[in-house]
Every structure is written in structure tokens, then in C-alpha cells.
């Protein structure tokens, strides 16, 4: 059976705030959970949505979320449906509304000494408490001539007299919060001696050195007085103008004219009307100096044909708010069509190539005009001028593959070799026009090449196969000097490649034929048993039909390979004594001997007084020290081969003779000369 682990419960909620109705279910089968509001399924919206099995409210709405919520779980194996307990919200809210005239029925019926009732249309749950204001001053219940009915949300003035005239507003507050009237009521009960506003001055914005006019008129019986003040309460009259308002004129009808306005004239102007009775009426208006800042620069834009794009023109800061319009080719853009202006945006729908060009955003106000250009490029898909062709490229020479395309903006070209991107290096170079240069063509360059030309609008690609025309060449070229061991078998290889498989043959440089014990087998010269007469110059000739022939000259030397007659032995020497490491080698040509001591070659010209290498190859070290210990290698070499052999040298302290030892007692050390190390 289905079990509710958590059930939704009724709760208080605040209008516009988050809330969560919890529901957690356990069932043996696959369970599907959904929510009902007054028996109808709840559809997910951004404001109200299922969160797991629970129902989440991003912002509670008193109209849409009033009612009974229920969580329903369905087991889709058995079909069983279980419904949770009902849950609802007690939504707390407050909503502003206007102050309206309840009695009499119209303003025209308001006369002095009649009863006037105003109603505050602020509503909420729980019911809020109300506070009334006249001209911003709170009215407390029980004051003379008015009563406040909180339940009715009414303010009653009885009887209403001129002293009740003013702007009436109300505020209400509850546990949810507070709100004030969205529209206030002006009660005007005439007392002829009170000043009344006929014309109030308005805020003005003017350009520098232009003129500004403020109108101000009051009426009363007898006529009221009118006075203008600027910012610092300085009175402005035609007789006494303050220094910074030399160009001010007050007309008989109360209007104030300022000519050649400068920054110091900007500020608040007050017009004060005073009747024979009643309070003065102070009206304010501000004079602003028009200004306009510079416009930010546009980045050039690249668009693709067929798409819809927008470019927003941020108007420069200015007063008054600058108006913005777009122009193209000197013509103002319309507010509809395919290319049009919407708000501050330039809109290009279904972009065509012909839309490319310079578009100008203009901004203007009283202070002047600013403009900024944006360069629009319409990207086109590249088209072919020349595709890469299947090519035969010669080995060792530069090779070129074309990939010539045109588009706007200039397309970028990349090359692939065997599906791998070619990065430019010493061998490959991609020219500005897209052509690929292979600096020195190699055999393994024979493969597939693909070039791709792209712009933001799209890309095209083509591939070509490269066939490498091989040079006729030796692979590898034979060593020009080679040695053969006397009285042994020897082979001298020679191989070559070309466009066609070359034939290879050997001949002696003097043109004489090869002796019968020397065979030429597919380019390998084979000596069954090397004699002294086999030494000399030989030529390997490789040839094929299309490429002719090439020759490689080889000088063969017959040598007796090196052997050691005497090799150095493992030697132990007392410190300060002399060490002798013998080495003698034989071979033809006669080998030269070099020594390596402790991993560095001992240069006979830089040995110093303690070391010496004899003509026969032996090494002598006088006055040996511990640091002379180590491995010594004798290296014998001639033009044909090289051999080495090594032995360790140990330098030890001479023992101090003990008194107990008789004159005939043997030394504790023997000069050891035992086995040696031998390497080929």
C-alpha cells in the first residue's frame, strides 16, 4: 500500500514570498506523484512547480494559490491511488489603492459647511489599520471637525471648511507590511482670501546660453502677493537681482524669464504665493542645464546571411534623455520591415549580403548630437576559385597544393594530412591565399591532403591525393670508406630506390672485372675470403629506364683487425709508488693506443709530470695518490676498427710496521696483479 511519510499541512504564507508544501511517499511499486488544487491537476510553471514530490512556490499569489491543495500518489503496478490530507495557505497580503471621494457623489457638489467623506482603498489580509494624512501631516482621531472610522476605512470632515483644503493621503499597515495610497485626493474648499494655485512652475531643461521661462500664478481676493526665490533663499525682483541672476526678469503675471542661462543658474526656483489669510503656498521647479556625453565605440560585427541579429546602441548619458535613431547610407531606418529600429536596437532580419556596410547610431538632445558608426560585415560561405588537385610531386623539391577560395570576411584555410591538422613547421607552410607548400617533398608525403576554408557563415572543403615521384637514390648511400677483415668473408651492401625499381651492379673503379671469388648478388658485393688484392676502389651503379643511372664510389680497405697482445691487469699500488698498466695491440694498419682514465680520455700532450704513455702503449703513473684509483681503459684503433680493454687500479695506504713484527715478516699487502677485464 502507499504510505505518506510527509503530508502537506496548512500554513501561513506571505504574498510574493517562497513556500513549500511537503509530500513524501513510499510504495512497493513505481510511484507517480502529482498535485491537485481544488480537485484539478496543478501544472508546473516557473512560479509554482513540483520539486521531487513536494510542491514549491517561488512567489505565493493570493489569487492563484487560494484553495485546497492535495498530493496524490499513484502506484503504476497496482493502479492504487492515495490522496494526502488537504492543505491550504493563509496568505497575508496588503495592496495599495487610491483615496476616493465617497460623499458627496462628485467634487462639484463640495461646498463649504457640507460633510465630506473620503475612503482609503488599501486592502489586505489580515485587515490593516489605517492612518490619514493632510499635506503629509498625520490626522489623529478625535481632532476637531473630523472623525476616522477604521472599520470603514473612512475619513469624515463635518462640516468641511477652507481650513480642510489640502492633499489627503492614507497609509495602512498589518502583520504583512505596509502600503500607502497609490493616488491621493486634493480637497479644495474655497476661501477667497486664501491663495490658490492657478499655474504652477514646471521643471525645465535648457541648453547653455538659451533662455528659460517659469510660469507661476496664484489667485485670491484681495489679490495675493507673489515672490520668487533661488536656491539660497535669495529673492529675485526686477529691482534687486542677485549677482548670478543678472539676466532674470519677473513679469507682472508672475512669470520668471532667465536669459543666456549658464551652469551657475541651474538649481531650484521657488515661487511663493501669500493670500490675506491662510498659509503661504510654496511651489518649486528646477532648472537643469542640458548635457550629453560621448558614445561608446562599437566593435565591428560579423553576421551570417539568413540569420537575425541585433546591435544595441546604448544612448549616452544626457539631460534630457537623448533620443536615439539609426541611419544607414544617410537614411534613417524605419521602425518595421526587414532592417529596422526597435527601441535602441538595430534589427537585421534574414540578413542579406547587401546589408553589409556602415550603420550609424545617432543620439541627440538639447545639448547637441553624438554619433557612432558600426561596421557590419555579412559573412558568406566560401566559394572555390581553385580546388586542390591530385598531384605528382617530385621528391626533394618543393611541392604546392592550391586551395584558393573567396568569401567575406577573408576565409581562414587549414590543411589536414591523413585527417591530422598540419601545423606550420620547417616542412610545411600555408600561404595567405591558402596554398600549401611542402618545402622538400619526402616519400612518405604521398597521401591524402584536405583543405578546409571557413568563415563564420560556414565552410567548404576538398581533398587531393599526392603521389610522390621518387628520386633515383641509394637507400642508404654506401659508406665511401669501408674495411674488410683479411682472410674472412665480407659483404658490401648497395641498395637504391626510384620511380621504377632500379637494377644494381658493382664494378671495380678501374673497369676490371670482379675475381671469381667475388660475387655481385642483387647489389650485395660478396667476398668469400678477403685477400690483400681485394682492396681498392669499387663503384655501385643503380639504373632504371626513366631516370638513368647513379653511381656511388667505395674505397675498400683490407685490414687485419685489432687484437691485444698485452692487456692491462687489475693492479694494486701503495700510495706514492709507481703504477704500470701495460697495453699492446696489433693489427693492420698498425693500431694507435689511447687511454681513458676515470671516464675521460688522457691526452698525451696534457698528462703532466706524473703520467706517461710509452711508445708501445703502456701507461705509467708515478707517485700515485688515492684519487688515481679507478678504471683505466686501453683503446686501440685504426682506420678499420677499434677495440678496448680495461682494468681497475687500486691505490692503498702503506702499512706502518708494528714492533712485534720481525725484520723478515711479510708485508700485509701484496702487489696484486690478477685477472683483467676485456671488452670488444
Amino acid at each position: 500500500a502507499i504510505v505518506f511519510i510527509k503530508q502537506p499541512s496548512s500554513q501561513d504564507a506571505l504574498q510574493g514570498r517562497r513556500a513549500l508544501l511537503r509530500c513524501e511517499v513510499e510504495a512497493p511499486g513505481p510511484v507517480h506523484v502529482y498535485w491537485l488544487l481544488d480537485g484539478a491537476p496543478v501544472q508546473d510553471t516557473e512560479r509554482r512547480f513540483a520539486q521531487g514530490s513536494s510542491l514549491s512556490f517561488a512567489a505565493v499569489d493570493r489569487l492563484q494559490d487560494s484553495g485546497t491543495f492535495q498530493c496524490v500518489a499513484r502506484d503504476d503496478v497496482t493502479g492504487e491511488e492515495a490522496r494526502s490530507a488537504n492543505a491550504s495557505f493563509n496568505i497575508k497580503w496588503i495592496e495599495a489603492g487610491p483615496v476616493v471621494l465617497k460623499h458627496p457623489a462628485s467634487e462639484a457638489e463640495i461646498q463649504p459647511q457640507t460633510q465630506v467623506t473620503l475612503r482609503c482603498h488599501i486592502d489586505g489580509h489580515p485587515r490593516p489599520t489605517y492612518q490619514w494624512f493632510r499635506d503629509g501631516t498625520p490626522l489623529s482621531d478625535g481632532q476637531s471637525n473630523h472623525t476616522v472610522s477604521s472599520k470603514e476605512r473612512n475619513l469624515t470632515l463635518r462640516p468641511a471648511g477652507p481650513e480642510h483644503s489640502g492633499l489627503y493621503s492614507c497609509c495602512a499597515h498589518s502583520a504583512f507590511g505596509q502600503a500607502c495610497s497609490s493616488q491621493n485626493f486634493t480637497l479644495s474648499i474655497a476661501d477667497e482670501s486664501f491663495a490658490r494655485v492657478v499655474l504652477a512652475p514646471q521643471d525645465v531643461v535648457v541648453a547653455r546660453y538659451e533662455e528659460a521661462m517659469f510660469h507661476c500664478q496664484f489667485s485670491a481676493q484681495p489679490p495675493p502677493s507673489l515672490q520668487w526665490l533661488f536656491e539660497d533663499e535669495t529673492p529675485i525682483t526686477n529691482r534687486s537681482r542677485p549677482p548670478h541672476l543678472r539676466r532674470a526678469t519677473v513679469f507682472a503675471n508672475g512669470s520668471l524669464l532667465l536669459t543666456q542661462v549658464r551652469p551657475r543658474n541651474a538649481g531650484i526656483y521657488r515661487c511663493i504665493g501669500q493670500g490675506q489669510r491662510g498659509p503661504p503656498i510654496i511651489l518649486e521647479a528646477t532648472l537643469h542645464l542640458a548635457e550629453i556625453e560621448d558614445m561608446p565605440l562599437f566593435e565591428p560585427r560579423v553576421f551570417t546571411a539568413g540569420s537575425e541579429e541585433r546591435v544595441t546602441c546604448l544612448p549616452p548619458k544626457g539631460l534630457p534623455e537623448p533620443s536615439v535613431w539609426w541611419e544607414h547610407a544617410g537614411v534613417r531606418l524605419p521602425t518595421h520591415g526587414r532592417v529596422y529600429q526597435k527601441g535602441h536596437e538595430l534589427v537585421l532580419a534574414n540578413i542579406a549580403e547587401s546589408d553589409a556596410g556602415v550603420y550609424t547610431c545617432h543620439a541627440a538632445n538639447l545639448a547637441g548630437q553624438r554619433r557612432q558608426d558600426v561596421n557590419i560585415t555579412v559573412a558568406t560561405v566560401p566559394s572555390w576559385l581553385k580546388k586542390p588537385q591530385d598531384s605528382q610531386l617530385e621528391e626533394g623539391k618543393p611541392g604546392y597544393l592550391d586551395c584558393l577560395t573567396q568569401a567575406t570576411p577573408k576565409p581562414t584555410v587549414v590543411w589536414y594530412r591523413n585527417q591530422m591538422l598540419i601545423s606550420e613547421d620547417s616542412r610545411f607552410e600555408v600561404f595567405k591565399n591558402g596554398t600549401l607548400r611542402i618545402n622538400s617533398v619526402e616519400v612518405y608525403d604521398g597521401t591524402w591532403y584536405r583543405c578546409m576554408s571557413s568563415t563564420p557563415a560556414g565552410s567548404i572543403e576538398a581533398q587531393a591525393r599526392v603521389q610522390v615521384l621518387e628520386k633515383l637514390k641509394f637507400t642508404p648511400p654506401p659508406q665511401p670508406q669501408q674495411c674488410m677483415e683479411f682472410d674472412k668473408e665480407a659483404t658490401v651492401p648497395c641498395s637504391a630506390t626510384g620511380r621504377e625499381k632500379p637494377t644494381i651492379k658493382w664494378e671495380r673503379a678501374d673497369g676490371s672485372s670482379l675475381p671469381e671469388w667475388v660475387t655481385d648478388n642483387a647489389g650485395t658485393l660478396h667476398f668469400a675470403r678477403v685477400t690483400r688484392d681485394d682492396a681498392g676502389n669499387y663503384t655501385c651503379i643503380a639504373s632504371n629506364g626513366p631516370q638513368g643511372q647513379i653511381r656511388a664510389h667505395v674505397q675498400l680497405t683490407v685490414a687485419v683487425f685489432i687484437t691485444f697482445k698485452v692487456e692491462p691487469e687489475r693492479t694494486t699500488v701503495y700510495q706514492g709508488h709507481t703504477a704500470l698498466l701495460q697495453c699492446e695491440a696489433q693489427g693492420d694498419p698498425k693500431p694507435l693506443i689511447q687511454w681513458k682514465g676515470k671516464d675521460r680520455i688522457l691526452d698525451p700532450t696534457k698528462l703532466g709530470p706524473r703520467m706517461h704513455i710509452f711508445q708501445n702503449g703502456s701507461l705509467v703513473i708515478h707517485d700515485v695518490a688515492p684519487e688515481d684509483s679507478g678504471r683505466y681503459t686501453c683503446i686501440a684503433g685504426n682506420s678499420c676498427n677499434i677495440k678496448h680493454t680495461e682494468a681497475p687500479l687500486y691505490v692503498v695506504d702503506k702499512p706502518v710496521p708494528e714492533e712485534s713484527e720481525g725484520p723478515g715478516s711479510p708485508p700485509p699487502y701484496k702487489m696484486i696483479q690478477t685477472h683483467h677485464h676485456h671488452h670488444h
Partner: antibody, heavy 113, light 112 residues
Amino acid sequence: QVQLVQSGAEVKRPGASVKVSCKTSGYTFTDYAMHWVRQAPGKGLEWIGVISTYYGNVSYNQKFKGRVTMTRDTSTSTVYMELSSLTSEDTAIYYCARGFAYWGQGTLVTVSS
Amino acid sequence: DIVITQTELSLPVTPGERASISCRSSKSLQKKDGKTYLNWFLQKPGQSPQLLIYLMSTRASGVSDRFSGSGSGTDFTLKISRVEAEDVGVYYCQQLVEYPFTFGQGTKLEIK
């Protein structure tokens, strides 16, 4: 025991509507939801929708939206499925299923001109 | 919509042998509660479908223990340990994660 008995076979003209019934017994009708599934000849199973028998709420497969109407009569413990604007593609066996554990015997609906 | 794919449309088996039927989903069928919402049905010739397995591996009431279900979030298998002649029919898998509930095309088990 749980029993779902469906109405008999129907033959309809293209453009017409068909209403298939599924009478239930052996359990408390309003405690269980009912699914409808159809199977075209030689084809697989296709879910049409589900009705909650308590409130009568429905969830339909978008494919049938606007053509299918599922209703229930709690007094007779019967669920109905009506399909309108019939075409030959709607020729199939229509099954009602309580959950997916208990199935009706199926109703063959043939749409032919 | 979630797409349920049964690759083998037909599966010939020798009686007594083991059979495996696979099913794949285009989206994970594992819900936040950790359960995998997949059903297996058998429709014998001329009959209504019958539920074999629910929640991927739970046998429905009265279903033989020769049937077992397993899988991951998107790949599922129904195994029959020793096939009997009465097991022939079309096997369907079905997802219950989101509307519309969708079925696989079905795999027909036949006796060799």
C-alpha cells in the same frame, strides 16, 4: 477478485468516433487509476493515457491530445475512452489496465471505409 | 519522449536453456528515490499482456522465479533461467519515468 471487462468489437468509418468501456469489479473503484493502451495488428504496445477515478483527472499522451477523452462513471464503476477523428491508423486492440498489473481482455476497433 | 529500444526482434531458444532479452533507454530510468522505473511484460499469443517484473528487478505476484530482471540506469536485461514451452510470446519493456509512458518494440521468444 479484480475483473476488467471491456465492451465488444467495433467497426467505424474514417472520421467517426468510438467509445470503448471498461467495467470493473472486485475492488473499490475510486481507489485505483486506469490506464489505456493500444496495440495495432502485429505491432507493439502504445500508451494512450491514464485517468484518476476519484476526481476524474486525466493525463494523455500528446500524440492523442485533442482526439482522446477519458471519463468514468463512479455509480457503475466503469471507465470510458473515446477516440475521435478516426483513421485507418487507429485500427488496433484497445486495452484498459488497472495500474499495469491487471488488464482487460481488449476491444478490437477496426476503422475502414 | 523517452525512446525504448529492444534490439533483438526475435530470439530462438532451446527448451531448458537460458535466455536473455535486452532493452535500452535513451535516458536514465533511475529516479531520485533510487528506484529504476522499468517494467517487463509477456504477451502470449492471443492474450492481453501480463506484468512479469516491475522496478527493474521485482517479480510481480505469481511470476515464476525463473524470471529475473537486472540492469543499470539505461541498459536492462530480462533473464529466463530455464526456458519452457509456455514462455513463448512477445516480451516488452516499458518506462514509467515520464509521460508518455513508452514501450520497447518487443522481442519474440520462439522455441527452436
